[in-house]
């Protein structure tokens, strides 16, 4: 992509293709960390096995993917789940159905700026499954407009239920458009 | 994407955005064809009809997607499976409930330089329907390394589920970034 | 990107990747708009609050993203739907079971040049929840061929099993590749 | 709930065209393929070939010089056209749906088409 | 193309007892994509089970398939009087899909 240009006078600063910050991270086996019932938990990932690249200056650090540049990215996720049969409200056999089991992904931004960390995309599925095992992926991905610094992180609602054993099926990108 | 420049020395060669290899490929109807029960399928796909494209030297050949230049692709696809009242195991009448039918989706590297495919994308999913027929789509995308020469597949767990009717329903593409 | 250049002669036109048409629009809480009972409904977006945003001629208007230049572009979007338990065929009572409840999400292209709207990209899913409230997100996204003009909007079964309630949980966005 | 109603002429003579048509109800028909198949007494049930909403098709090899599926202009109705038939191809035809993919979970009520001189 | 030979031709059974149908393919039938359909005198075939042992919509837990490669098999648990008909098997493992000749169950 370049600009229709007639003279060699100065342009704009643009990042080559090959030269903008992306990153392909790989899921790997969670140690488990406390955290509150309610609180979603941050997964850590592989940076730079197997399939797993950061390139361009984007840096993965202590659970979180570092935007070097500001401009707009595709960010994308997928988590795979699996459990054992789950707790979910039985309306044959009580008036008040219970809340059902869920599971829940929420790719998270974390600005210098900003105090709160933003909630950049949720995928959320309720849980109601009657027999014996069960596994089920949420994917997830759009863009955004980050700045230099901003901090992206992948929370989940429950670690124990996220597929850890394979590569393909558990993992987290994001590139510059 | 252009880098600022002062003169006009030769610059690194980058592919411009409109020329970069890129495919959309639809489904089309799956001719049943012999392979092993636990074995995953190949799909074949529309690569020139409707909305299925390939553009830039990206070729489709033999249910491959055939990369021509190396670089960093996003690859997707979704598939969409249809069928009737699954067989899941009933953890009510069986004490040790039966493995649950299931849906899978791989999405396959072959490297003339690596004997062994290597999945990259994997989207998996239990099937517990009770009642009726169901449907449903796996949805999969992330980018990828990739080499020239490298080749792309779908695969799934049984090709006899897809929905091959409709291709806003059931597709495969991948782009440079 | 740029091509290899030797001499600062006329280059073809390219969009740097800065200056791309983009959009990434945010649900909003719908009004209710009468329609026929088997005809999908279209979702109207925000298009500039929070996380929203069209840039560089990407125009939002009366629920479509208009196309400002030809091109080819990945498209998406997350519905998440929500609901009570779905009246799907119980087997157990009913020899001749109901067809399921389903959620269907569609990307409907519209151009001027075609009368007839075209489907992009549907999910679409049965829902058979035995229990209590469900919740689930449909996620689609792909790359098209698509002309200056062109209008983008996305269709549902059932407006009102939207879950209109966060900005990161159902959105709709596209960039010019 | 699907309902395929079929019809068209029940007796031909030999090197005629068998021509039947089958109209599809309760579904979209853009969501399946569509099928026909035959039941003689003597080569018991064939499956002679399918089409789907776009007008692709797929044949049986031993039929296919003989054997034309097409689709009404508007889509639904289809039919079956069936060349220079002798008397081997008497039967009761049946239109049916594809589902989930080349099994047939729903039929026509079935034609008698008798083939004699 | 694949035959399917259906065995025996005929099972004389009364209600409440075990059926047992049994259908061999010439060759390896892939991936277990094998139909049971059952028929009565007048009327079209209904399908009961796919992928070897998956039951269609609304067939009862009685009928109950089995088996891979070339020989399957289909299970009536206990007979119900309107069971009694007669019952094709179909491969869809390549390319003609072909049908087995039949088996009756009648009533004893």
């Known amino acids: 992509v370049t600009e229709e240009r007639s003279a060699p006078s100065a342009q704009p600063v643009y990042t080559p293709s090959r030269d903008k910050p992306k990153a392909h991270l790989t899921i790997m086996r969670q140690t488990p960390v406390p955290h509150l019932k309610n609180e979603l938990a941050a997964l850590h990932w592989e940076n730079n096995l197997g399939m797993a690249f950061t390139k361009n200056r984007m840096n993965y650090t202590n659970k979180f993917l570092v935007i070097p540049e500001s401009g707009d990215y595709f960010i994308y996720s997928q988590i795979t789940f699996r459990g054992t049969t789950s707790e979910c409200g039985d309306i044959s056999r009580v008036r008040r159905p219970k809340k059902p089991d869920s599971i829940t992904v929420v790719i998270t931004k974390v600005a210098d700026s900003y105090p709160e960390p933003a909630h950049l995309l949720t995928g959320t599925k309720s849980v109601c499954e009657i027999s014996s095992n069960w596994f089920q992926p949420i994917y997830l991905g759009a863009m955004f407009s980050l700045e230099e610094g901003d901090r992206l992180m992948v929370n989940v609602s429950d670690i124990s239920l996220v597929d850890y054993t394979k590569e393909d099926k558990t993992f987290f990108g994001a590139f510059l458009i | 994407v252009t880098e600022e420049r002062s003169a006009p020395s030769a610059q690194p060669v980058y592919t411009p955005s409109r020329d970069k290899p890129k495919a959309h490929l639809t489904i089309m109807r799956q001719t049943p064809v012999p392979h092993l029960k636990n074995e995953l399928a190949a799909l074949h796909w529309e690569n020139n009809l409707g909305m299925a494209f390939t553009k830039n030297r990206m070729n489709y050949t033999n249910k491959f997607l055939v990369i021509p230049e190396s670089g960093d692709y996003f690859i997707y696809s979704q598939i969409t499976f249809r069928g009737t009242t699954s067989e899941c195991g009933d953890i009510s009448r069986v004490r040790r409930p039966k493995k649950p039918d299931s849906i899978t989706v791989v999405i396959t590297k072959v490297a003339d330089s690596y004997p062994e495919p290597a999945h990259l994308l994997t989207g998996t999913k239990s099937v517990c329907e009770i009642s009726s027929n169901w449907f449903q789509p796996i949805y999969l995308g992330a980018m990828f390394s990739l080499e020239e020469g490298d080749r792309l597949m779908v695969n799934v767990s049984d090709i006899s589920l897809v929905d091959y009717t409709k291709e806003d329903k059931t597709f495969f593409g991948a782009f440079l970034i | 990107v740029t091509e290899e250049r030797s001499a600062p002669s006329a280059q073809p036109v390219y969009t740097p990747s800065r200056d791309k048409p983009k959009a990434h629009l945010t649900i909003m809480r719908q009004t209710p708009v009468p329609h026929l009972k088997n005809e999908l409904a279209a979702l109207h977006w925000e298009n500039n609050l929070g996380m929203a945003f069209t840039k560089n001629r990407m125009n939002y208007t009366n629920k479509f993203l208009v196309i400002p230049e030809s091109g080819d572009y990945f498209i998406y979007s997350q519905i998440t739907f929500r609901g009570t338990t779905s009246e799907c065929g119980d087997i157990s009572r009913v020899r001749r079971p109901k067809k399921p409840d389903s959620i269907t999400v569609v990307i409907t292209k519209v151009a001027d040049s075609y009368p007839e709207p075209a489907h992009l990209l549907t999910g679409t899913k049965s829902v058979c929840e035995i229990s209590s409230n469900w919740f689930q997100p449909i996620y689609l996204g792909a790359m098209f061929s698509l002309e200056e003009g062109d209008r983008l909007m996305v269709n549902v079964s059932d407006i009102s099993l939207v879950d209109y309630t966060k900005e990161d949980k159902t959105f709709f966005g596209a960039f010019l590749i | 709930q699907v309902q395929l109603h079929q019809w068209g002429a029940g007796l031909l003579k030999p090197s005629e065209t068998l021509s039947l048509t089958c109209a599809v109800s309760g579904v979209s028909f853009s969501d399946y393929h569509w099928a026909w198949i035959r039941q003689s007494p003597g080569k018991g049930l064939e499956w002679i070939g399918d089409?789907?909403?776009?007008?692709?098709?797929n044949y049986n090899p031993s039929l296919k010089s003989r054997v034309t599926i097409s689709l009404d202009t508007s889509g639904n109705p289809f039919s079956l056209k069936l060349t220079s038939v002798t008397a081997a191809d008497t039967a009761v035809y049946y239109c049916?749906?594809?589902?989930?993919?080349?099994?047939?979970?729903?039929w026509g009520q079935g034609i008698l088409v008798t083939v004699s001189s | 193309e694949i035959v399917l030979s259906q065995s025996p031709g005929t099972l004389s059974l009364s209600p409440g007892e075990r059926a047992t149908l049994s259908c061999r393919a010439s060759?390896?039938?892939?991936?277990?994509?094998l139909a049971w359909y059952q028929q009565y005198p007048g009327q079209a075939p209904r399908l009961l089970i796919y992928g070897a042992s998956r039951r269609a919509t609304g067939i009862p837990d009685r009928f109950r398939g089995s088996g891979s490669g070339t020989d399957f098999t289909l299970t009536i648990s206990r007979l119900e009087p309107e069971d009694f008909a007669v019952y094709y098997c179909q491969q869809y493992g390549s390319s003609p899909l072909t049908f087995g000749g039949g088996t009756k169950v009648e009533n004893k």
């Open positions: 089409i789907n909403h776009r007008g692709r098709t």
């Open positions: 060759q390896s039938v892939s991936s277990s994509f």
């Open positions: 049916a749906r594809d589902f989930p993919n080349w099994v047939f979970d729903s």
